[in-house]
């Protein structure tokens, strides 16, 4: 299963549900289906209030039963560890895959934590994080922000991912905007044509 690198804002905007939750144990295979489910304990919902209607929480996260079907494998044994889970809502259930944005909450930068709670949503449906994985690359639209972490940092974890969101500057223009949490190193150009 090959997964394209994803900026956290893209993960947030493309998901039906974004929650904080703890994994409560080993997965349970669901007979006669290609799926298994993890019992989870949701601690906070960050996105999906409209989608879930009256549902008050999710007890399970469903994923394909095999890694070869892009199934998610939860490796942590720590039941008290809180994870950010960005998934899809399918038939009223939380659905995740090996490519889902799913990370320990404490592994997110303070700026990312803040953005998942309130900032990323402002860019959804308006702005697009456009990955630049090879030079040359250029912006295709004023609503795009060029994401250069993979080139500059050699990884999808970089300054833009950790500290910036692609947000509307005015109705026709989106730009990288600093999320306002202190940083220890200098910044690359926030929006540039590589």
């Amino acid at each position: 299963c090959s997964c394209a690198p994803t900026h956290p804002q893209t993960a947030f905007c493309n998901s039906d549900l974004v929650i904080r939750a703890k994994f409560m144990g080993s997965p349970e295979i669901i007979e006669t289906t290609l799926y298994q489910r993890y019992e989870i304990k949701m601690t906070k919902m960050l996105k999906g209030f409209d989608a879930v209607g009256n549902a008050t929480g999710f007890r399970f996260a469903y994923t394909p039963a095999m890694e070869s079907l892009c199934g998610y494998v939860h490796k942590s044994q720590n039941r008290s560890e809180e994870f950010l889970i960005a998934g899809r809502l399918r038939n009223g259930n939380l659905h995740i895959t090996a490519c889902s944005f799913l990370v320990p909450w404490h592994n997110l930068s303070p700026a990312q934590q803040k953005a998942f709670v309130k900032t990323y949503s402002a860019g959804c449906g308006v702005c697009t994080v456009f990955p630049c994985s090879a030079i040359p690359c250029k912006l295709e639209s004023d609503s795009h922000c060029l994401w250069t972490d993979q080139i500059l940092m050699g990884s999808e974890k970089g300054y833009q991912s950790d500290h910036f969101a692609c947000l509307p500057r005015n109705p026709d223009l989106c730009t990288w905007q600093y999320l306002g949490v202190s940083m220890t190193r200098s910044l690359p150009l926030a929006k540039a044509e590589a």
Epitope: C1, Y35, S68, C70, L89, N93, H95
Partner: antibody, heavy 120, light 108 residues
């Protein structure tokens, strides 16, 4: 290009055995699941089961569990669907298809189909 | 039983737009219906037209588009052409792998 080529049409009698094949080319055969789909005359599509040629892991639809056997020979990039004792109700077109697995499971490449006719 | 319900038939004239619906049985609140769509001409194998609700594989005309609203997914064909006459099937994999019953599209 990516393609799946199936074996030719078969005419059999009830009670006989049969094994039809599906040969993949143009991609890494061991890295994708292969599914089998039945289409009875004038009817819709029914998923029968899937196999991962890399390790021969197999999953069946409950409706077809115990009725057919799905196997694969990765050395010749071929998947198989077989019956040990055919019935008249097995008369149908059978398709193999490559299963794409992200973000959801769907069939992106299909074989041309094998028509199986079971009649006394 | 899990099922996807499609209209048995739909028709339209050349140049028109038509929509084929695919409704899941789930009564769950917020039960989004993520499906793929296939086209099958008589005597031919099915062909993938739309995956993950609204994505088109390369080579598929942009006259074909997909959408979802709650528990119903839809396939829309704009600028209907004679060669669009075929059977169309929706398919979901969750919680079980299942195809809709199929819709026969007739171009008048």
């Amino acid at each position: 290009q990516v393609q799946l080529v199936q074996s030719g049409a078969e005419v059999k009698k009830p009670g006989e055995s049969l094994k039809i094949s599906c040969k993949g080319s143009g991609y890494s055969f061991t890295s994708y699941w292969i599914g089998w789909v039945r289409q009875m005359p004038g009817k819709g599509l029914e998923w029968m089961g899937i196999i991962y040629p890399g390790d021969s892991d197999t999953r069946y639809s409950p409706s077809f569990q115990g009725q057919v056997t799905i196997s694969a020979d990765k050395s010749i990039s071929t998947a198989y669907l077989q019956w040990s004792s055919l019935k008249a109700s097995d008369t149908a077109m059978y398709y193999c298809a490559r299963l794409f697995t992200y973000p959801f499971l769907y069939f992106d490449v299909w074989g041309q189909g094998t028509l199986v006719t079971v009649s006394s | 039983d899990i099922a996807l319900t499609q209209p048995a038939s739909v028709s339209g004239s050349p140049g028109q737009s038509i929509t084929i619906s695919c409704t899941g049985t789930s009564s769950d609140v917020g039960g989004y219906n993520y499906v793929s769509w296939y086209q099958q001409h008589p005597g031919k194998a099915p062909k993938l037209m739309i995956y993950d609700v609204s994505n088109r594989p390369s080579g598929v005309s942009n006259r074909f588009s997909g959408s979802k609203s709650g528990n119903t997914a839809s396939l829309t064909i704009s600028g209907l052409q004679a060669e669009d006459e075929a059977d169309y099937y929706c398919q979901s994999d969750f919680p079980v792998m299942v195809f809709g019953g199929g819709t026969k599209l007739t171009v008048l």
